[in-house]
């Protein structure tokens, strides 16, 4: 069963800034990836950004870069500033497309004891909806 | 969360007409597109119409002047009209909501399908 983890952390230069890395684990070809935060895609969160593997990436404030690190991982740097900043409580989700196929995703947050700069290596997170 | 069900789909002659429904509930922010994307039987996937968040529709080559699409925002839904429906046009027809990248919708969530059979 294809899963998908998600990676919250903090930059120890800029405390309000946060990079977010998400991973598919499955064999199946990705056709769409979106990272949102407050909830999961279509259900209540905010799209930060979208990146198709070949026509391109749309992003919105706060996120300042995405990108794609694999052809099944991606990551997105935000910047905090103001209203729009996000705090260390903030869930992030990523859902992975596959159209017809079906999409996964999964949420992550900063953990609670983490300190700026530090993470652990990338964990496969629960999957909260396979369609 | 986003569920798209299409229905109208089924047998019909060649040169007949089908009309596609697809009813849309809850929503994904910043979504700016909604259409119909269609796979043949061992065939790739194909976009098929969109409607971009500007209202404008846009059509794949193949179906210009025979298919229109469109959508009642009041329903939530979202329309396939298909005139002078010819064999190649059967597929399993999907509705889509997704993000726009140029002139292509990229489908971010969908239906489960409904087949389209042209057939005499």
């Known amino acids: 069963t294809p899963e998908v983890w998600v990676q919250v952390r903090m930059e120890a230069t800029e405390l309000s800034s946060f990079t977010i890395r998400c991973g598919f684990l499955g064999s199946g070809s990705i056709s769409l990836v979106t990272v949102s935060w407050g909830g999961p895609n279509g259900a209540g969160g905010t799209t930060l950004a979208v990146l198709h593997p070949e026509r391109g990436i749309r992003q919105w404030a706060p996120a300042r870069q995405a990108r794609w690190e694999t052809q099944s991982s991606i990551s997105l740097i935000l910047e905090g500033s103001g209203a729009s900043s996000p705090c260390a409580n903030t869930t992030f989700c990523c859902k992975f497309a596959s159209f017809p196929e079906g999409s996964w995703e999964a949420c992550g947050s900063l953990p609670p004891s983490s300190d700026p700069g530090l993470s652990a290596p990338p964990t496969p997170a629960p999957i909260l909806r396979a369609d | 969360e986003v569920q798209l069900v299409e229905s109208g789909g089924g047998l019909v002659q060649p040169g007949g007409s089908l009309r596609l429904s697809c009813a849309a509930s809850?929503?994904?922010?910043?979504?700016?597109?909604m259409g119909w994307f269609r796979q043949a039987p061992g065939k790739g996937l194909e976009g098929v119409a969109h409607i971009d968040s500007d209202g404008i529709p846009r059509y794949v080559e193949s179906v210009k002047g025979r298919f229109t699409i469109s959508r009642d925002n009041a329903k939530n839904s979202l329309y396939l009209q298909m005139n002078s429906l010819r064999a190649e046009d059967t597929a399993v027809y999907y509705c889509?909501?997704?993000?726009?990248?140029?002139?292509?919708?990229?489908?971010?969530?969908w239906g489960q399908g409904t087949m389209v059979t042209v057939s005499s």
């Open positions: 809850g929503f994904t922010s910043r979504t700016d597109c």
């Open positions: 889509v909501v997704g993000f726009k990248f140029g002139d292509y919708c990229a489908p971010n969530d």
